[in-house]
Interface confidence: medium
């Protein structure tokens, strides 16, 4: 509450987290020309990346393009991409939607359909739709335990939110242990009054924020956090801007003297977490 | 404008970046003893990496020292490293400009000049000049979606800079399109007052500060962002303080059972989306 | 100091950072069944990682889990987790602290234990402590060039913290030179009055506080920064809520056409730059 | 020192079985993963089989799966191969050996992971 006669300050804050589960993922396999069902294991160090700070990202959902490798090859024929002559297809042109640079020669993709050539990672990525349901769906019942360490200088004022009282085997629920600082990513996506089995597919960014209103007078002392979360990234986007979460990385190699690189397209939901809130003091 | 009459509220902001553009990269490329020239296609996943928050990174020039491994080697030649006897050599010495810890003896670089011998990754990564042109200076004409979501908790106001009516093939320009959060890379720079090409070949960090000045009275609501660009880098600092922006990574591999590595020096623009406003009510 | 006439603003910021040094380290290797003394050399890119904003990690400790495959093992017998027979082990299960999926069957670990089998990447790690001393102690005599720009926008004032007339071989100290931005980072444990070799063992985090208090009138104009340095995480933390600073990454390869990963878990020290203050104006 | 015997081997007809034997004496192996390996003539020598320590984890080569059997009694400190379904490709000299690590989850298939003490025994199999 406002209290006029405080001098108030801005939190300093830094934050950590750590992600924990383990997801079961059944996909179909093609080896050899023969598709099969191969199951697999995804712990932290596969569905997440070290990073600092606010954020943390878990893959939720991938498609991968495997053996790619520098060459000459025939673009994928997205809506608006086929040729039936060289003429369509443009020498040194770059579509932004396309993969490679066009050599200006239109030739077969497939026994139906003649696509501009291009010098790209080939075979070019498939724009294929995202797996539904999303492979790592399980990760709903993955967990996150976040730190927070806050600092109000102007009053010298430090403090965190893990109290040495706490059980680090909680979880947090809004009415029963709302300052247990283990979250279940599902129990946020539902506070948050989404579904985690949707945004997963397309992958999406969850907000987490900590509010904290302290009064740092010593006969009225108060200063703990208070969480709320709020999906941030828009569900209604249009397509031409890119809805959910996603980002392509590579795992390069090298096979008989030649570079290649496995292309991961990867979807899953990005938190941020937003610290904010003042110290006031008389 | 400043209503005094108003409680202001500074914003909490999210952002989610998405870069678009392929280059073509043409270089000398030694195999065998032979020097020839090498074409390739960078992609994103290329050239960025996968980064959370308020920043992104687009490579625009690298070094690379291939196949280094963990041995023995006389030390990289540069100024005042060159050596006559090993009184020159400190056994344990670790040059904050060299890349290994010196053995104590003299020995021979090439032909004509010796150095001290050195335990590290050999052998040593060249000290040489990042290559002009800038190999990837064609990202000029990336673009980059920038997605940003603000929060006014007091007032329980969230908005975000892409509305339902915009159209997801517009580009930025300050007179014909303010509002739209596509940007070229090369206009960034001409905006800030920059030339891209010349940045491109030691990097640099590039500043969006995107202003949300918010009235959020219902009889004369406003709320949209304001972009503006400035370089973040000192282009005249002392060659001491490290000029430009790279970091060094390494990509690890075995090769008859010896743990090898390529390691690259990376520069580039780091583009530091800096949102700040204050959203005002009566 | 306040001036109550002046209009405050409060500081936007950008930070680069650029850390130096290498660590000679020194670990039983097990090769062919012999175990031997290995020594290794660490430069930047052995030990950090290209990350963005106001961080950076620099790994002080590690423990790796070499060749790790996709099948089906008995778990590590931490404490609580052996059995004596299949009744123990229920199918599909999994445990927050194991590293799999159980399989239902109670399998030998070793001569004398035996644990429920799961299906995880194999052989699982192994819930060793952290060696002690840490493997890059010597990481305390690294050191980090801290580059800060800083703009109050509404008074249209930029500076930054390295100025024209700095010295590149200076080396931050509180009294001597209390405007260096070159840091070493066993310094800033000193500063903070703690002990980089017992923190380098598990880990933590270490602020960097950069404090501008800026008067921008023309008449009395000051803005350089001050320099502050505080350990953020909780070192008396309970092990349930996961003390020091760690986090797990892999390194994937095929051998044989057979998928492999070496799981590294990374110790380290994560330093926060945080930056705060005002600029202050008629 | 550790000595590895095998036995077992000789002629037979495609389609026949024959059961290898390695006995291992000096030490006990029952704390070691240990395989089969075999060699044509003019050929290197490959991986056929091998068994974790405690006989639950096996693992074979793709041309075998399904035809030979992998076991070991620990309490005689003995390997074993049923070998079923033979075929021409199989003729070799066969090798035991017991794992020196690290990691057989991941290296049982190669042989410088492997001690080989023994002097092989020869499998011919005639079509």
């Known amino acids: 509450s406002d209290k006029l006669y405080q001098r108030k300050e801005p939190v300093i804050s830094s934050v950590h987290t750590k992600v924990k589960g383990i997801a079961e993922v059944t996909e179909n396999v093609t080896e050899g020309g023969v598709t099969k069902l191969g199951h697999s294991i995804f712990d932290t160090a596969d569905y997440t990346f070290p990073l600092q700070g606010n954020s943390f990202f878990v893959m939720t959902n991938y498609v991968k393009s495997e053996g790619q490798v520098q060459t000459l090859c025939p673009e994928y024929p997205r809506r608006g991409a086929q040729c039936s002559s060289d003429r369509r297809c443009k020498k040194g042109w770059m579509d932004p939607q396309s993969k490679g640079i066009q050599t200006g020669r239109c030739v077969p993709y497939d026994k139906t359909r003649k696509t501009c050539e291009v010098s790209a990672w080939c075979p070019t990525e498939e724009e294929k739709e995202a797996p539904r349901p999303a492979l790592l769906r399980s990760a709903e019942n993955f967990t996150v335990l976040i730190k927070n360490n806050i600092h109000f200088p102007g009053h010298n004022y430090t403090t965190r939110n893990i109290l040495p009282t706490m059980n680090g085997s909680c979880t947090f629920h809004k009415t029963w242990d709302p300052q247990c600082s283990i979250f279940r990513l599902g129990d946020i996506f539902q506070e948050a009054g989404e579904n985690f089995t949707e945004v997963a597919v397309q992958g999406g960014i969850m907000g987490i924020e900590i509010y904290w209103d302290c009064n740092l007078d010593s006969w009225s002392h108060h200063c703990r956090p208070r969480y709320s979360f709020r999906r941030l990234d828009d569900k209604n986007m249009d397509e031409s801007f890119v809805p959910g979460y996603n980002f392509r990385y590579a795992k390069y190699y090298k096979e008989n003297n030649v570079e290649k690189r496995t292309l991961i397209k990867a979807f899953g939901i990005r938190f941020d977490i937003l610290v904010f809130g003042t110290g006031g003091k008389f | 404008s400043d209503k005094l009459y108003q409680r202001k509220e500074p914003v909490i902001s999210s952002v989610h970046t998405k870069v678009k553009g392929i280059a073509e990269v043409t270089e000398n490329v030694t195999e065998g003893g032979v020097t020839k020239l090498g074409h390739s296609i960078f992609d994103t996943a290329d050239y960025t990496f996968p980064l959370q928050g308020n920043s992104f990174f687009v490579m625009t020039n690298y070094v690379k020292s291939e196949g280094q491994v963990q041995t023995l080697c006389p030390e990289y030649p540069r100024r005042g490293a060159q050596c006559s006897s090993d009184r020159r050599c400190k056994k344990g010495w670790m040059d904050p400009q060299s890349k290994g810890i010196q053995t104590g003896r003299c020995v021979p670089y090439d032909k004509t000049r010796k150095t001290c011998e050195v335990s590290a990754w050999c052998p040593t990564e060249e000290e040489k000049e990042a290559p002009r042109p800038a190999l990837l200076r064609s990202a000029e004409n990336f673009t980059v979606l920038i997605k940003n979501n603000i929060h006014f908790p007091g007032h329980n106001y969230t908005t975000r800079n892409i509305l339902p009516t915009m159209n997801g093939s517009c580009t930025f320009h300050k007179t014909w399109d303010p509002q739209c959060s596509i940007f070229r890379l090369g206009d960034i720079f001409q905006e800030a007052g920059e030339n891209f090409t010349e940045v491109a070949v030691q990097g640099g960090i590039m500043g969006i500060e995107i202003y949300w000045d918010c009235n959020l009275d219902s009889w004369s609501h406003h709320c949209r962002p304001r972009y503006s660009f400035r370089r973040l880098d000192d282009k005249n600092m002392d060659e001491s303080f490290v000029p430009g922006y790279n970091f060094r990574y390494a990509k690890y591999y075995k090769e008859n059972n010896v743990e090898k590595r390529t390691l690259i020096k990376a520069f580039g623009i780091r583009f530091d989306i800096l949102v700040f406003g204050t959203g005002g009510k009566f | 100091s306040d001036k109550l006439y002046q209009r405050k603003e409060p500081v936007i910021s950008s930070v680069h950072t650029k850390v130096k040094g290498i660590a000679e380290v020194t670990e039983n290797v097990t090769e062919g069944g012999v175990t031997k003394l290995g020594h290794s050399i660490f430069d930047t890119a052995d030990y950090t990682f290209p990350l963005q904003g106001n961080s950076f990690f620099v790994m002080t400790n590690y423990v790796k889990s070499e060749g790790q495959v996709q099948t089906l093992c008995p778990e590590y017998p931490r404490r609580g987790a052996q059995c004596s027979s299949d009744r123990r082990c229920k199918k599909g299960w999994m445990d927050p602290q194991s590293k799999g999926i159980q399989t239902g069957r109670c399998v030998p670990y070793d001569k004398t234990r035996k644990t429920c089998e799961v299906s995880a990447w194999c052989p699982t790690e192994e819930e060793k402590e952290a060696p002690r001393p840490a493997l890059l102690r010597s990481a305390e005599n690294f050191t980090v060039l801290i580059k800060n720009n800083i703009h109050f926008p509404g008074h249209n004032y930029t500076t930054r913290n390295i100025l024209p007339t700095m010295n590149g071989s200076c080396t931050f100290h509180k009294t001597w030179d209390p405007q260096c931005s070159i840091f070493r980072l066993g310094d800033i444990f000193q500063e903070a009055g703690e002990n980089f070799t017992e923190v380098a063992v598990q880990g933590g985090i270490m602020g960097i506080e950069i404090y501008w208090d800026c008067n921008l009138d023309s008449w009395s104009h000051h803005c350089r920064p001050r320099y502050s340095f505080r350990r953020l995480d909780d070192k008396n933390m309970d092990e349930s809520f996961v003390p020091g600073y760690n986090f797990r990454y892999a390194k994937y390869y095929k051998e044989n056409n057979v998928e492999k990963r070496t799981l590294i878990k990374a110790f380290g020290i994560r330093f926060d730059i945080l930056v705060f203050g005002t600029g202050g104006k008629f | 020192e550790v000595q590895l015997m095998e036995s077992g081997g000789g002629l037979v007809q495609a389609g026949g079985s024959l059961r290898l034997s390695c006995a291992a004496s000096?030490?006990?192996?029952?704390?070691?993963?240990m395989g089969w390996f075999r060699q044509a003539p003019g050929k290197l020598r490959e991986f056929v089989a091998s068994?974790?320590?405690?006989?639950?984890?096996?693992r074979y080569i793709d041309s075998v799966e399904g035809r030979f059997t992998i076991s070991r009694d620990n309490t005689k400190n003995t390997l074993y191969l049923q070998m079923n379904n033979l075929k021409a490709e199989d003729t070799a000299v066969y090798y035991c050996?017991?794992?020196?690590?690290?990691?057989?989850?991941?290296?049982?298939?190669?042989?410088?992971?492997?001690?080989?003490y023994g002097q092989g025994t020869q499998v011919t199999v005639s079509s």
């Open positions: 000096g030490r006990t192996v029952s704390d070691y993963g």
């Open positions: 068994i974790n320590w405690s006989g639950i984890y096996t």
């Open positions: 050996a017991y794992f020196l690590g690290p990691n057989w989850y991941s290296n049982y298939g190669r042989p410088s992971s492997y001690d080989f």
